[in-house]
């Protein structure tokens, strides 16, 4: 805590400028009016203040706005934002997307800090849902943002926002998250024609059920192996050899290289060996000819 001392004669700051970098901590505290600082916050980013001086400037703003800074100040915090704690940020009411963008810009190119995570959380909660413009902004700065949300949080994403999602935004999503996103994507892209629809839905297919994969197999989509390997195992298992062949098209040859990995391995174990042989890929591990396959899950459902 900086002691309250009188400002030396002639040192009272009339504006926020570079002369202030020569002020000692106590001089900054005594000679810079907090209201002046608040109105000229945008100038701070062009002045090479020391870390200690930034602490003093933050302290002055904290005294002026004990309940939290107004948005007019927040928008111009610049690198002083990085001196804020999550507790400070929880006091803020950020409603403008421009303010959010300005603060995200400060940390651009670096992983999400606790300050940024708190800011985003406050902003999204304030809006009530993750609208398209917000999602656009957040994924532009943090491609992995969507996959950092819980399935519960993702449920508040309106289908219209899905248009803002790029394939790389889903790279780190797990199956539970894709389970939530896939139905939204299906709804968002429902009016597109076959090939265009597949291009858009492809990144979300890790959440697709069997019946949707069967439908896609009838549309000559030529799914690549990387996408196939991300499908839910439980959704792939019921597919027939013919359906997988149609789904993958010319990429079906890639199954051989993946035969020891899920979901291919588990799918092979469920197919008749003579059906697998029709692919001519030398896939082994299918059900030998002459064996009877009982679907116990169906039996349990009937009893």
């Amino acid at each position: 805590e900086v002691e309250k001392t009188a400002c030396p004669s002639g040192k009272k700051a009339r504006e926020i400028d570079e002369s202030l970098i020569f002020y000692k901590k106590w001089e900054l505290e005594a000679c810079v009016d907090a209201a002046l600082l608040a109105t000229q916050m945008d100038r701070v980013n062009a002045i090479p203040f020391t870390y200690e001086q930034l602490d003093v400037l933050k302290h002055k703003l904290d005294e002026l706005y004990p309940q939290g800074y107004p948005e007019s100040v927040i928008q111009h915090l610049g690198y002083l934002f990085l001196k804020m704690s999550p507790e400070d940020i929880r006091k803020w009411n950020v409603t403008s997307l421009e303010t959010l963008k300005a603060l995200l810009e400060v940390n651009k190119g670096h992983e999400m800090s606790p300050q940024v995570a708190t800011l985003i959380d406050r902003f999204v909660k304030g809006r009530g849902q993750l609208d398209k413009d917000t999602l656009d902004t957040l994924t532009a700065f943090y491609p992995g943002y969507l996959c950092s949300l819980s399935p519960e949080e993702l449920s508040s994403v309106p289908p219209s926002s899905i248009w803002a999602v790029r394939p790389q935004d889903l790279d780190t999503c797990d199956p539970r998250q894709l389970d939530v996103l896939y139905p939204k994507a299906r709804l968002a892209f429902q009016n597109m024609n076959g090939s265009e629809y597949f291009v858009k839905i492809q990144s979300f297919l890790g959440g697709a059920p069997t019946e949707d994969l069967k439908a896609l197999s009838q549309q000559n989509v030529s799914m690549d192996l990387a996408t196939f390997m991300k499908l839910r195992t439980d959704a792939v298992l019921p597919l027939t050899v013919a359906e997988v062949q149609k789904l993958l098209g010319p990429h079906v040859e890639g199954l051989k290289a993946e035969e020891r990995h899920r979901p291919v391995r588990d799918w092979i174990l469920r197919q008749r060996q003579d059906d697998l042989d029709t692919l001519g890929l030398g896939l082994q591990g299918g059900i030998p000819n002459g064996y009877l396959v009982l679907d116990l899950s169906m039996q349990e459902a009937l009893s």
């Epitope: 062009a46 002045i47 090479p48 203040f49 020391t50 870390y51 200690e52 001086q53 930034l54 602490d55 690198y79 990085l82 001196k83 704690s85 190119g109 670096h110 800090s113």
Partner: antibody
Framework: QVQLVESGGGVVQPGRSLRLSCAAS????????MNWVRQAPGKGLEWVAV????????YYADSVKGRFTISRDNSKNTLYLQMNSLRAEDTAVYYC????????????WGQGTLVTVSS | DIQMTQSPSTLSASVGDRVTITCRAS??????LAWYQQKPGKAPKLLIY???SLESGVPSRFSGSGSGTEFTLTISNLQPDDFATFYC?????????FGQGTKVEIK
């Protein structure tokens, strides 16, 4: 006067870990930011990481992100660099250097410690 | 990250010469640029900061200029002690990237 002394360098096998230290004196350590910069044999300078005075913010070069961790103990006036999953290309002299603010240059440097990653 | 490109990579000069080294940033860095001098086996030494401000104790024959993306370091009257490698570094972003260096050697 300002003094920065690095230690902890040595020969280490690829994939292993090493922790470098930098002991600071002659200035108020808790007031200033600290950086690690490295220089591979016969090559130029490469900035590695920075940590703000209070440890609240840390930034890394893409080449070390996820493998190296910068930290500091202000009570001991010491800066650290924890290096995991080391690779041959991490072989370099590692310098610690001070900055006084986000828009300040590196005004004081240590003499460096050599890290050799080799099997 | 901001890329810094220095030229030339090597410069041959004689004592008394005026030498100029150029540094170009991949995007505007305002005036947040420093120049360092490094001698073999030694740590770098800060010469100039904020593009043109001379660090305390550095001889006045060293000067810097430029802003935005184009910067120069000039040594007006090269001395025997000046033969070394010089680096520029931007500090406009938290990832403080260096140029690849310019070696000033005796002609």
């Amino acid at each position: 006067q300002v003094q920065l002394v690095e230690s902890g360098g040595g020969v280490v096998q690829p994939g292993r870990s090493l922790r470098l230290s930098c002991a600071a004196s002659g200035f108020t350590f808790s007031s200033d930011g600290m950086n690690w910069v490295r220089q591979a044999p016969g090559k130029g300078l490469e900035w590695v990481a920075v940590i703000w005075n209070d440890g609240s913010n840390k930034y890394y070069a893409d080449s070390v992100k996820g493998r190296f961790t910068i930290s500091r103990d202000n009570s001991k006036n010491t800066l650290y660099l924890q290096m995991n999953s080391l690779r041959a290309e991490d072989t370099a002299v590692y310098y610690c250097a001070r900055d006084r603010g986000p828009l300040w240059p590196l005004d004081y440097w240590g003499q460096g410690t050599l890290v050799t990653v080799s099997s | 990250d901001i890329q810094m490109t220095q030229s030339p990579s090597t410069l041959s000069a004689s004592v008394g010469d005026r030498v100029t080294i150029t540094c170009r940033a991949s995007q505007s860095i305002s005036r947040w640029l420093a120049w360092y001098q490094q001698k073999p086996g030694k740590a770098p030494k800060l010469l100039i900061y904020k593009a043109s401000s001379l660090e305390s104790g550095v001889p006045s024959r060293f000067s810097g200029s430029g802003s935005g993306t184009e910067f120069t370091l000039t040594i007006s009257n090269l001395q025997p002690d000046d033969f070394a490698t010089f680096y520029c570094q931007q500090y406009a972003s938290y990832s403080r990237t260096f140029g690849q260096g310019t070696k000033v050697e005796i002609k």
